[in-house]
């Protein structure tokens, strides 16, 4: 999916009002400096691409993020504010339902959510010095 035509300001508002708090709740008890940055993004569409990948694609050691509160709110925000996003996700959602797993918070998941927090921060960053 190409995130170029999303309403970035509306997505930013959704992040600031709820998604950010859910991410913090998930990470509670973890030091903010515990994980180094291992993924980045270079503009808002790119950030959303990486956020979607880390939130909804199962990875080795962390297969369960898609059912977390922050993930469901992320999905809702993208569905509302990114034209045509919902249609592209129907097949992916059906496949996900088939392989639903027991909810376990592993260290790998904590690291992944830490990277998500970094990507969301970049998505919401103020303009850098423009020189």
């Amino acid at each position: 999916y190409d995130f170029t035509n999303c309403d970035f300001e509306k997505i930013k508002a959704a992040y600031l009002s709820t998604i950010s708090k859910d991410l913090i709740t998930y990470m509670s008890g973890t030091k903010s400096t515990e994980f180094n940055n291992t993924v980045s993004c270079s503009n808002r569409p790119h950030c959303l691409t990486e956020i979607q990948s880390l939130t909804f694609n199962p990875t080795a050691g962390c297969a369960s993020l898609a059912k977390e509160m922050f993930a469901m709110k992320t999905k809702a925000a993208l569905a509302i504010w990114c034209p045509g996003y919902s249609e592209t996700q129907i097949n992916a959602t059906q496949a996900m339902k088939k392989r639903r797993k027991r909810k376990v918070t592993t260290n790998k998941c904590l690291e992944q959510v830490s990277q998500l927090q970094g990507l969301w921060r970049r998505f919401n960053r103020p303009l850098l010095k423009q020189q």
């Epitope: 940055n37 980045s40 790119h46 970049r122 960053r125 020189q131």
Partner: antibody, heavy 122, light 108 residues
Framework: QMQLVESGGGVVQPGRSLRLSCAAS????????MHWVRQAPGKGLEWVAV????????HYADSVKGRFTITRDNSKNTLNLQMNSLRAEDTAVYYC???????????????WGQGTMVTVSS | SYVLTQPPSVSVAPGQTARITCGGN??????VHWYQQKPGQAPVLVVY???DRPSWIPERFSGSNSGNTATLTISRGEAGDEADYYC???????????FGGGTKLTVL
């Protein structure tokens, strides 16, 4: 852990070519801008080239423009520097480094390799 | 192209504060990054975006940037701080990375 490892350095005659490689591990390579920076013996750091995270755009220092080519293979997590028409003044340790970018601004180089020595001598 | 100017050397007594400057035209409008390099080693980022510090760098390292001068401040200097320090910016107008000439810090 996050790592950059350079290879391909050595002794080469003036006018000849050399290809340096940088293997990245421990981070999502395709999301970072990548640089080559060099350091002549006893001298300061000199930036050589940068390639965008996607490979779409490339920028070179004037001193290497037209002679050096930076490329990346995001599927293999590798960065390359093809150096042609080498000169004695290209003698240096060559480092690869990563930097996040925002739009067309490259941010700080937060991870560096250990460097590979290139000596251009007849 | 853009030029960054650093003093070749700075000395500090153990426990005292060292200040390393980096000068450039209208430098305050650029994001300045600082690197530490010890002999035979690769550079290490110590301050980025003028004043931010990576999580692995001690709080003794800090930075500021305004007008035509950026400053790296190292408080309570230690023998282990002896190194070369480089400032760096991304010059958007020419799409080039620019490094300062480097400053050798000596802890007396």
């Amino acid at each position: 852990q996050m790592q950059l490892v350079e290879s391909g350095g050595g002794v080469v005659q003036p006018g000849r070519s050399l290809r340096l490689s940088c293997a990245a591990s421990g981070f999502t390579f395709r999301t970072y801008g990548m640089h080559w920076v060099r350091q002549a013996p006893g001298k300061g750091l000199e930036w050589v080239a940068v390639i965008w995270y996607s490979g779409a755009y490339i920028h070179y220092a004037d001193s290497v423009k037209g002679r050096f080519t930076i490329t990346r293979d995001n599927s293999k997590n590798t960065l390359n520097l093809q150096m042609n028409s080498l000169r004695a003044e290209d003698t240096a340790v060559y480092y690869c480094s990563r930097s996040p970018q925002w739009e067309d601004i490259f941010e700080a180089m937060d991870i560096w390799g250990q460097g590979t020595m290139v000596t251009v001598s007849s | 192209s853009y030029v960054l100017t650093q003093p070749p050397s700075v000395s500090v007594a153990p426990g005292q504060t060292a200040r390393i400057t980096c000068g450039g035209n209208n430098l305050g409008s650029y994001s300045v990054h600082w690197y530490q390099q010890k002999p035979g080693q690769a550079p290490v980022l110590v301050v980025y975006d003028d004043s931010d510090r990576p999580s692995w760098i001690p709080e003794r390292f800090s930075g500021s940037n305004s007008g035509n001068t950026a400053t790296l401040t190292i408080s309570r200097g230690e023998a282990g701080d002896e190194a070369d320090y480089y400032c760096q910016v991304w010059d958007m107008s020419s799409s080039l990375v620019v490094f300062g000439g480097g400053t050798k810090l000596t802890v007396l």
